[in-house]
């Protein structure tokens, strides 16, 4: 029955059970919809747009980390259609902050106006 | 065996019909959407309709819309094309293509029939 | 409409060269692009879809790259099977929409 399917899950007349959407592969994310017991015919996937990844499953596309823009770090590996962008060390003129927990994303870089005097990445 | 045969091609007055048939045969026809693209003398592609797998959803381009019916059988695992009020314009090469499972992309493509709108 | 343009309607190359193929649409088209190889005898075949993806089958000197309006597919040693009419194809928006094809012709 439709209404017993899951999230992921839509109703096979066929076999009067409920069957797994497909998943999406890698640099994919699905287009239009799959689950609780109903699917579009045309469901699909679709290719991530520039700047966005994803590993597939039925993930969305989400956007690659802005590492110079929003971390103030050096592009370590840019982000492509199935991987997310890697950041590596600070920009010039930021330094990381030691024994400060990552956030989710990583260290954040933060300038060196708001130095401790001698921070080796602030120096000269 | 060749997956996408197209038949149905021939000569035809303007204003006149004509059927065209796709026969499908090596996979599961009734999983997959289907499109029929055309190709006139010395031009590129045009995309011209397309059905899903259930017949559900049908699509068609401003060029023909209104004068073609694209429809299918999924029990006899045949595509179809009925074109009507045939213009000198319609004269092309036609080919069924297949749709890729889950994706957007013509994975597929039968060898055509030609149609000529001629008096 | 998306209007895709190949502005190269037709090639020349020796064999063993790289080729580089160029399609341009109107609008972003999002990654959304396949690239088809006709022979002279009007077979169709698909190459590369979604920009970059290799088909099944499709020998690897063949490879797709672009993003946003502008795309292109290079074969890397041209060999003498490679001999066709190549064409583009936005699938982002209906109606999908071919380039006008590129014509490859050997020196």
């Known amino acids: 029955e439709y209404s017993n399917c899951g999230e992921n899950e839509y109703y096979n007349q066929t076999t009067g059970l409920c069957q797994e959407c497909p998943p999406c592969g890698p640099g994919e994310e699905p287009y239009l919809s799959c689950g609780y017991g109903t699917k579009d015919e045309d469901y699909g996937c679709v290719p991530c747009p520039a700047e966005k990844f994803s590993k597939g499953g039925y993930q969305i596309c989400r956007r690659h980390k802005d590492c110079e823009g929003f971390f103030r770090a050096t592009v370590l590996t840019p982000g492509d259609m199935e991987n997310d962008a890697e950041c590596g060390p600070c920009l010039p003129g930021y330094y990381m902050l030691e024994n400060r927990p990552r956030n989710i994303y990583g260290m954040v870089c933060y300038s060196c106006l708001l130095a401790p005097p001698n921070t080796k990445e602030c120096v000269g | 065996e060749v997956p996408l045969e197209e038949s149905g091609g021939g000569l035809v007055k303007p204003g006149g019909s004509r059927k065209l048939s796709c026969a499908a045969s090596?996979?599961?026809?009734?999983?997959?959407?289907m499109h029929w693209v055309r190709q006139a003398p010395e031009k590129g592609l045009e995309w011209i309709a397309y059905?899903?797998?259930?017949?559900?959803?049908?699509y068609y381009s401003d060029t023909v819309k209104g004068r073609f019916t694209i429809s299918r059988d999924n029990a006899k695992n045949t595509l179809f094309l009925q074109m009507t009020s045939l213009r000198s314009e319609d004269t092309a090469m036609y080919y069924c293509a297949r749709r890729e499972l889950l994706r957007f992309y013509f994975d597929v493509w039968g060898a055509g029939t030609t149609v000529t709108v001629s008096s | 409409d998306i209007q895709m343009t190949q502005t190269t309607s037709s090639l020349s190359a020796s064999l063993g060269d790289r080729v580089t193929i160029s399609c341009r649409a109107s609008?972003?088209?999002?990654?959304?692009l396949n690239w088809y190889q006709q022979k002279p005898d009007g077979t169709v075949k698909l190459l590369i879809y979604y920009t970059s993806r290799i088909h099944s089958g499709v020998p690897s000197r063949f490879s797709g790259s672009g993003s946003g309006t502008d795309y292109s597919l290079t074969i890397s040693n041209l060999e003498q099977e490679d001999i066709a009419t190549y064409f583009c194809?936005?699938?982002?928006?209906?109606?999908?929409?071919f380039g006008g094809g590129t014509k490859l012709e050997i020196k």
């Open positions: 059905i899903s797998s259930g017949s559900s959803n049908v």
């Open positions: 609008q972003d088209i999002g990654n959304h």
């Open positions: 090596g996979f599961t026809f009734s999983d997959h959407g």
């Open positions: 194809q936005q699938g982002n928006t209906l109606p999908w929409t």
